[in-house]
């Protein structure tokens, strides 16, 4: 029975005399008067078996002690660690000439674990062992002896096992412990590659090349290799593995990404939190699922937020000129979280009697600059038929519109070609200006050309230069424009609409809001 003792991870013990419980029972020759087995205690009061010999008074000593058979376990080189005490001959009276201060270590390779008789000549000598510290009379007087430790190695070995032998030639020795071990490079993980327990090579300078295998949930980037050195240390790691998509490195392992995290590719990156408007419900996600109503375009990276189609364009304005129509609009309030917004124009030709009976306009109609994929917020439509009702739809689209097309993404206007629109309004007046509002009034156009259905007021901050305008519609010839900013210059245009369409906008009226209320009568010129 062998008790367990702790040794370095790169050493595999084949024999440890200190761990043997009960007698070692090694073979001594001669049987009497030579090596003697002695039981002593270790520091934990556990018995350990030792061998001692001290025939220093008699000449020509040749005392042999042979171990049991020791399996090699595939090792080509083994190490023998001997802890022993050795008396200094000078400390022993009357032994000059007969006392020695060394002993010899031998080995014999064998496939037979039960060899009874091995001739001395069959053993190969490993070394002569001398003490670093021999024990003088002073040591004896102190009654506490230091232990010598000597390590020798032997190899290459080829048979299944071997026997060790200790030859005493007249010394006073106690073998306190004998440990036989071989060295291995212990199982390890480097760069996410696992390298197995590897027995060191036969020579003290040899390197054993070992190919590693990627840990679970990882894949080779470059072929992982290492070299097992003779001392049981791994050397020169080459190549590596990378955690698969959906996994990240943690303590030398590839762990699945937690819920709410993802990793799209086999890289050395960590899992990332799901981008905005997306989620993962399983561990090990390689991408995150978009929230309801949100989408990811084909060319969107997994790291991009999920987005949605834009809302409808705002403030669509039409201007009919015989068989041409100019359309103008503002950007949608909500772009869906994307930059790739563009506009498509849909033209429908509708029957005069039943506006619901509409057909596509066909290829004869031309669009400037283009019909689809417009980056600007205006288009001119030409080559329309005269005296015809047209409905124009402006669709705001982005990279994910195709996943969820909806009428909510378009705005439409209906016009009739070839009817004269009203003339422009000659006079627009600012009746009252406050800090936050302007009261406007105007006259009917000189040439209404029909029944005025409504007036349209377009206004914007002067320094915005018509980039961002607002529209107010009214059937009356006056209106209060509210929600303005104090001390700000605004530009106002007004036009009339009849069944034939919109007339031209009036000349601009520039008004600056006040810091204190006052009445200002406009005369069509700039007011301040």
């Amino acid at each position: 029975v062998t008790g367990s003792r702790v040794y370095p991870a790169n050493e595999v013990t084949l024999l440890d005399s200190r761990s043997v419980q009960g007698e070692l029972g090694w073979i001594a020759s001669p049987l009497e008067g030579g090596w003697e087995e002695v039981s002593i205690m270790d520091e934990k009061n556990t018995p350990i078996r030792t061998y001692q010999v001290c025939n220093v008074m008699e000449a020509s000593q040749n005392n042999w002690l042979r171990t049991d058979w020791i399996t090699r376990e595939g090792a080509q080189r083994v190490y023998i660690e001997i802890k022993f005490t050795l008396r200094d001959c000078n400390s022993l009276p009357g032994v000059m000439g007969t006392c020695k201060e060394t002993f010899n270590l031998y080995y014999y390779e064998s496939d037979n674990d039960k060899e009874r008789f091995i001739r001395e000549s069959q053993f190969g000598k490993i070394d002569t062992i001398a003490a670093d510290e021999s024990f003088t009379q002073v040591d004896i007087g102190d009654r506490i002896m230091k232990l010598n430790t000597e390590i020798r190695d032997v190899g290459p070995l080829s048979k299944k096992g071997f026997y060790l032998a200790f030859q005493d030639v007249g010394a006073c020795i106690a073998l306190v412990s004998v440990r036989v071990f071989y060295k291995k490079c212990p199982l390890t993980v480097r760069n996410l590659a696992q390298f197995p327990d590897t027995i060191t090579g036969a020579d003290t300078s040899s390197l054993v090349e070992v190919r590693g295998s990627c840990v679970n949930n990882s894949e080779e980037k470059d072929v992982p290799k290492m070299y097992c050195g003779a001392d049981g240390e791994w050397l020169v790691p080459i190549g590596n593995c990378l955690c698969n998509a959906g996994h990240e490195e943690q303590n030398g392992e590839c762990q699945a990404c937690k819920i709410g995290y993802y990793k799209a590719l086999s890289t050395d990156a960590s899992c990332a939190k799901c981008p905005p408007h997306s989620y993962s419900v399983w561990e090990g996600a390689t991408s995150c699922t978009c929230d309801r109503g949100f989408f990811r375009a084909d060319n969107d990276a997994a790291s991009m937020p999920c987005t949605r189609p834009p809302s409808a364009p705002l403030n669509l304005i039409s201007n009919v000129n015989e068989t041409s129509v100019n359309l103008e609009w503002s950007s949608p309030q909500n772009t869906g979280g994307r930059q790739d917004i563009s506009y498509n124009v849909v033209c429908k030709k509708c029957g005069a009697g039943d506006p619901s009976k509409c057909r596509p306009c066909g290829s004869g109609v031309h669009y400037t600059p283009q019909q689809n994929g417009l980056k600007t917020t205006r288009v001119s439509i030409t080559d329309l038929l005269a005296h015809t009702n047209y409905t124009f739809e402006i669709w705001a689209v982005n990279g994910v519109s195709k996943y969820n097309p909806s009428p909510d993404q378009s705005v439409s206007v209906t016009v009739t070609t070839n009817q004269a629109a009203p003339s422009s309004i000659a006079l627009v007046q600012a009746k009252e200006v406050t800090r936050y509002s302007v009261a406007l009034a105007w006259l009917e156009p000189d040439r209404p050309n029909g029944v005025i259905l409504e007036y349209e007021v377009k206004y914007y901050e002067k320094d915005q230069n018509e980039r961002s305008y607002r529209i107010v519609r009214t059937a009356a010839r006056n209106t209060d424009i509210k929600g303005l900013n104090p001390l700000t210059s605004y530009v106002f245009h007004v036009r009339a609409r009849t069944a034939a369409g919109y007339g031209d906008f009036s000349e601009p009226l520039e008004v600056t809001t006040n810091t204190v209320p006052s009445r200002i009568i406009g005369d069509g010129a700039n007011s301040t």
Partner: antibody, heavy 126, light 112 residues
Amino acid sequence: EVQLVQSGAEVKKPGSSVKVSCKASGGTFSSYAISWVRQAPGQGLEWMGGIIPIFGTANYAQKFQGRVTMTRDTSISTAYMELSRLRSDDTAVYYCARELLYCSSTSCGTHGFDIWGQGTMVTVSS
Amino acid sequence: DVVMTQSPLSLPVTPGEPASISCRSSQSLLHSNGYNYLDWYLQKPGQSPQLLIYLGSNRASGVPDRFSGSGSGTDFTLKISRVEAEDVGVYYCMQALQTPLAFGGGTKVEIK
């Protein structure tokens, strides 16, 4: 249970020698040290010397050097102490005592006299 | 040689009460291996001595836990937490670091 059994009382003339034996029963005799301690009537304890197997030879107190010889015969598990040139002040009870040997990873030593013989009275008188 | 000095020479005790014996050495008994090489023995009337404590503070096998040893270097103490009638006798300390081994002069413990 190890016991140390000593030889019987002795009466000796001054100048003569006495040899006291100490036989161990139980245990492995070679596995422990044997020391000899004496106690003069009404006095304290006095260490004379001993044999520690892994030290190789006997070790004697300077006071008894040249007069005392300690030996052991492992075949019969017996230790001996011989004191020569006896004087009247050698009158004492002579004890043999066992010391357990121990070794740590760096040194070896002993763990006290854990078993004692019953004592042998040696009287030196003319 | 190392000289061992014990005190007191005599210690009258009451059963159930604690008792303490001091031992001083002329040289340190602390070895470089960390052990103090000091033992305590009790010799009951008409008997051979028996080991109580070895290496300064380790109780020998079968010794009741009311006995404890302490100290390091040159000053050591044996304590009996609650003296019992069977504890009477002469207590000796002994240095086991160097030869010659040396015993203290002894402390006689007796019931009041």
